[in-house]
Structure formats: structure tokens, C-alpha cells
């Protein structure tokens, strides 16, 4: 028998890489049985994470699922970083794993490491 | 229910390629990552990578770097491991394994898939 | 990368008799969010390998609870109290709190 505690399905370890000046959305999936519950996004600043008021959010819902969507339009280089979604639900937190974007910024991507850098040097992906 | 359906088994010859797959159904691929492993004859097991097929982000193990190239298609809810310059140290079964909603915990596997390289 | 050493390699035992598996990492797999990604899986001869415990000590679905897992940081342990039959076979530790993720060597559980 399932649960029907709210589970928050952002994968573990999680990475985006995106393009800076780009629409990006990112999902938080959302499992729940009755009633939808109260999701918000915080960005990590540390140990800390920040509440992300005044952004643009949505619902979608699939079968099964529903996914609680962050708009970045259009993404910024300052939007790197990882992110975490939580919901309230029975007086509880439930807290997300972190995912993380890694945003290039268009400008100064000449100075990045190439695809073919990042092959022949592993270690590299490993941030 | 929950199933992966790897391609048969194969047979090639040395310096060639081969493209595995791995086939998911009872849950959408996009959800979760895609996990490969490998078990030589007789020996134990080793993780070669995994990729999200929501983005194709992957990681692998340094050692499966050139030698393995993981991609997913959400489309056809299936993944793929290509491995290139084959050797006889390439003849194993290649594993697919599925998290529950990336949970980074190889909860569900494929039935293996028999790869012999040999002139 | 985090060397993940089981022992013993092999264990042999009479059915009925209860088994211990130990399993010692490189380092700690206790991960930032506070779980400790480290799994057990049994590989039963011509099958596919199939996980019986996760995050050190709990339960999959199905397995019986004669299965238990401890430990933390970097020893751990699996347990078999009243090994059966369909018990024997060839087990695997494994860690997932670091890239790349690492199984142990296995330990084959066979028959007196």
C-alpha cells in the first residue's frame, strides 16, 4: 500500500547545465493524495535556504504526479547555484534533495572547458 | 508493474561497436535515472555511469570514460549504452538499473544483457 | 574513488545457522543531506542481481526479516539469522553517497 505522505521526488544529485538568456523551468514533482499541498522553492546560500518570493510559479499535473514549476524567464548567470523545493503538509516540512543549475553565460563561454577538455579531463565533471 | 527489457545478446568482433538498450515500462524513464553495470565472467560488479534522461546529464566512472557513452530517448522510454574500440575485456553482462524518482538507490534491473567480443 | 572491502569472500554454512557479511568503506558514507547510501543486494546464481536493504537497514519489499542491516560511517554489516535455501548466492555492498559509486568485491554464501 502506498503512502499518502506528500513525497517530493527531485532527484538526488541532480544537475542542469543551461544557457544564460535561455527560458529554463525546473520541476519540482509532487506526490500527494487529497489535497495538494503548499510547495515553495528556496535557493541554498550556504547552510541556508533563501525563500524564493516574487517568482513566477506553476502547477502542471500528470498522471499520477503534479510538478511544481520554477520560471526562470530568462535565465541569468546569477541563477547558478542549487536549489531545494519543501512542502507543508500536516504541520510538517517536508524538505527536497538539491538540484543543482550550472548556468553559462553566453559572453564568456569562449573561456569555458570544451566538450573534448571535459572528456580528457574527468575530473572536471566532478564539481 | 515495473520492468526493463534489455536487447539480446551479442556477439562482435574486436575494434567494432555495440549499442545496448534498455527498455522501461510501468513508470516514465524521465522520472528516474538509468543506471549501467558491468559484471565480467565470474567476477563482481562495477558501476559504469548513470544519466538522467530528463536532461542527458551523466556522470560516469573515470574508468568507463571514452570507452562507454550512456544516452536516453524519454520518447521511446528507453536508454542506451554504446561502447566503442571493443576488447575481449569488454565481453560481460551489461546491467540496466532504474531508481524510484532518482533516488540514487538501483531499486529496479533489467535481465542483463550477454555481450561476447571475439574475432 | 571510495573502495568498498567485504569480507569474508567466501562463508560457508549449514542451513538453519545464521551468517554475518561485513562490509567497510574508504571512508564514511554518511552524505550532507543525513542518510548513508549504502545497499545490499543478493545475486542468486543466472540472475540478475536483486537489492534486499537500502540506506544501511532498511527492509525491500519482499525480503524476509531474517535480513538485517547495521552499522554507520564507514563499517557495516548484513545478517542472516537462519540461513534457507534461497539464500545462498553471492552478496554485494554497495555505496552511493559518492561518485563514482562502488560495490564491494562480494561475498558467496554457499553450503557446508
Known amino acids: 500500500k502506498e503512502s499518502c505522505d506528500v513525497q517530493l521526488y527531485i532527484k538526488r544529485q541532480s544537475e542542469h547545465s543551461i544557457l544564460a538568456g535561455d527560458p529554463f523551468e525546473l520541476e519540482c514533482p509532487v506526490k500527494y493524495c487529497a489535497n495538494r499541498p503548499h510547495v515553495t522553492w528556496c535557493k541554498l546560500n550556504g547552510t541556508t535556504c533563501v525563500k524564493l518570493e516574487d517568482r513566477q510559479t506553476s502547477w502542471k499535473e500528470e498522471k499520477n504526479i503534479s510538478f511544481f514549476i520554477l520560471h526562470f524567464e530568462p535565465v541569468l548567470p546569477n541563477d547558478n547555484g542549487s536549489y531545494r523545493c519543501s512542502a507543508n503538509f500536516q504541520s510538517n516540512l517536508i524538505e527536497s534533495h538539491s538540484t543543482t543549475l550550472y548556468v553559462t553565460d553566453v559572453k564568456s563561454a569562449s573561456e569555458r572547458p570544451s566538450k573534448d577538455e571535459m572528456a580528457s579531463r574527468p575530473w572536471l565533471l566532478y564539481r | 508493474e515495473v520492468q526493463l527489457q534489455q536487447s539480446g545478446a551479442d556477439l562482435v568482433k574486436p575494434g567494432a561497436s555495440v549499442k545496448l538498450s534498455c527498455t522501461a515500462s510501468?513508470?516514465?524513464?524521465?522520472?528516474?535515472?538509468a543506471h549501467w553495470v558491468k559484471q565480467r565472467p565470474e567476477q563482481g560488479l562495477e558501476w559504469i555511469g548513470r544519466i538522467d534522461p530528463a536532461n542527458g546529464n551523466t556522470k560516469y566512472d573515470p574508468k568507463f570514460q571514452g570507452k562507454a557513452t550512456m544516452t536516453a530517448d524519454t520518447a521511446s522510454n528507453a536508454a542506451f549504452l554504446q561502447l566503442s574500440s571493443l576488447t575481449s575485456e569488454d565481453t560481460a553482462v551489461y546491467y540496466c538499473?532504474?531508481?524510484?524518482?532518482?533516488?540514487?538507490?538501483?531499486?529496479?534491473w533489467g535481465q542483463g544483457t550477454s555481450l561476447t567480443v571475439s574475432s | 574513488e571510495v573502495v568498498m572491502t567485504q569480507t569474508p569472500l567466501t562463508l560457508s554454512v549449514t542451513i538453519g545457522q545464521s551468517a554475518s557479511i561485513s562490509c567497510k568503506s574508504s571512508q564514511s558514507l554518511l552524505d550532507s543531506d543525513g542518510k548513508t547510501y549504502l545497499n545490499w543486494f543478493l545475486q542468486r546464481p543466472g540472475q540478475s542481481p536483486k537489492r534486499l536493504m537500502h540506506?544501511?537497514?532498511k527492509l525491500d519489499s519482499g525480503v524476509p526479516d531474517r535480513f538485517t542491516g547495521s552499522g554507520s560511517g564507514t563499517d557495516f554489516t548484513l545478517k542472516i539469522s537462519g540461513v534457507e535455501a534461497e539464500d545462498l548466492g553471492v552478496y554485494y555492498c554497495?555505496?552511493?553517497?559518492?561518485?563514482?559509486?562502488?560495490f564491494g568485491g562480494g561475498t558467496k554464501l554457499e553450503t557446508k
Open positions: 554497495w555505496q552511493g553517497t559518492y561518485f563514482p559509486y562502488t
Open positions: 538499473v532504474a531508481d524510484h524518482y532518482g533516488s540514487s538507490l538501483l531499486d529496479y
Open positions: 540506506l544501511v537497514s
Open positions: 510501468g513508470f516514465n524513464f524521465k522520472h528516474t535515472y
